[in-house]
Amino acid sequence: MAVTACQGLGFVVSLIGIAGIIAATCMDQWSTQDLYNNPVTAVFNYQGLWRSCVRESSGFTECRGYFTLLGLPAMLQAVRALMIVGIVLGAIGLLVSIFALKCIRIGSMEDSAKANMTLTSGIMFIVSGLCAIAGVSVFANMLVTNFWMSTANMYTGMGGMVQTVQTRYTFGAALFVGWVAGGLTLIGGVMMCIACRGLAPEETNYKAVSYHASGHSVAYKPGGFKASTGFGSNTKNKKIYDGGARTEDEVQSYPSKHDYV
């Protein structure tokens, strides 16, 4: 029950996170005009990954897309790439995790396969979240650098008579949305990985052999990482030899600690 809850919650958290990453990527407020030195402007500038906008006090807003690809800063291109990679990985992760959900029955899919898919989606969510956090952080760093550079030469003019106030940009709402969304996706991914451990059978999917020493009833069982199952076919009930060695499938009939959660 707890495994299903963990998996379900991980899925929902990741879903919210990826929706947030998509929203942040599409938002225009990645950087907004800093009004600290100029709160009396009637024209407010803000910029996104794809276009820059100007909002006038009258309510009129005009946005212009970045129609050039080669003329854009390399950092902006890198941020775009990171966000898109994050979205793509997250979307694939969501697709995989839907089929991996314990509450959804698809044919005769085994728990081992579901565990694998849960782990795969979890890793995808983690990478997706990291991509989003990295993208937003790179952009934020770029803003901080530009902010202090423009502050250094804020007032440039003819003999101090004319002031040309350089427009400075500060963090926009999209950055905070991106950070939170990336974090949620990351948390969701971790939860999926935790759920995967509970979904996996007690033993690993390769043929675990227990050796019975004469006169002893203690069996040695190799207990590798339970999630290291493959998508490959599992030959059922195939005995290796009769003298005390059993296949994993026979051992599975013993109660597992996860059966009573």
Epitope: T41, A42, N45, Y46, C53, G59, V162
Partner: antibody, heavy 118, light 113 residues
Framework: QVQLKESGPGLVAPSQSLSITCTVS????????VYWVRQSPGKGLEWLGV???????NYNSALMSRLSISKDNSKSQVFLKMNSLQTDDTAMYYC????????????WGQGTSVTVSS | DVVMTQSPSSLSVSAGEKVTMSCKSS????????????LAWYQQKPGQPPKLLIY???TRESGVPDRFTGSGSGTDFTLTISSVQAEDLAVYYC?????????FGSGTKLEIK
Amino acid sequence: QVQLKESGPGLVAPSQSLSITCTVSGFSLTSYGVYWVRQSPGKGLEWLGVVWAGGNTNYNSALMSRLSISKDNSKSQVFLKMNSLQTDDTAMYYCARDRGRLLAMDYWGQGTSVTVSS
Amino acid sequence: DVVMTQSPSSLSVSAGEKVTMSCKSSQSLLNSGNQKNYLAWYQQKPGQPPKLLIYGASTRESGVPDRFTGSGSGTDFTLTISSVQAEDLAVYYCQNDHFFPFTFGSGTKLEIK
């Protein structure tokens, strides 16, 4: 067609308050901002303030403490209220419509003359 | 506040002549976001309210004769009347539309000889 018409008291005693109404037609106050501008006799134009389509306002910092601009969208009226009038507040008071883009005043009222005298 | 300085304060020309008047602002009126200058020119004839001629420093308002041209960027702006007509007798004001308060210049009075 777009029209703006100011109506005021004409004569105001010093230290008293001034109330002017600008009645508009041909456009909606929910879509356009309205400015107030005054012109002292033989002098230039002085921007007083604005009420935007959304209802938010901006004022001339020199007059902010005694100036108030409001509106009634349903009645298509904009109101200017100024307190503690002095003789140098004697002027022609105009209301004007914001053109929407690039913030300029495209339509003006004929103005109302206000004299501050005892 | 942004100070708008107009020059000359008055000028007298004959009909058909070309006229240029200047307007300087204490702060740049060019917005980096859309590369637009937030400056307007108004014409005020005696006994009348002002009339919008130019907005965005160079865009002519509809119905304004094409002999009126606005130019300039940043802090220096110019209004040019290519061939002055008798009806152009008026005071011309420039206005900052970028920073509150939206200050006006002191005006340039155009007289016809």
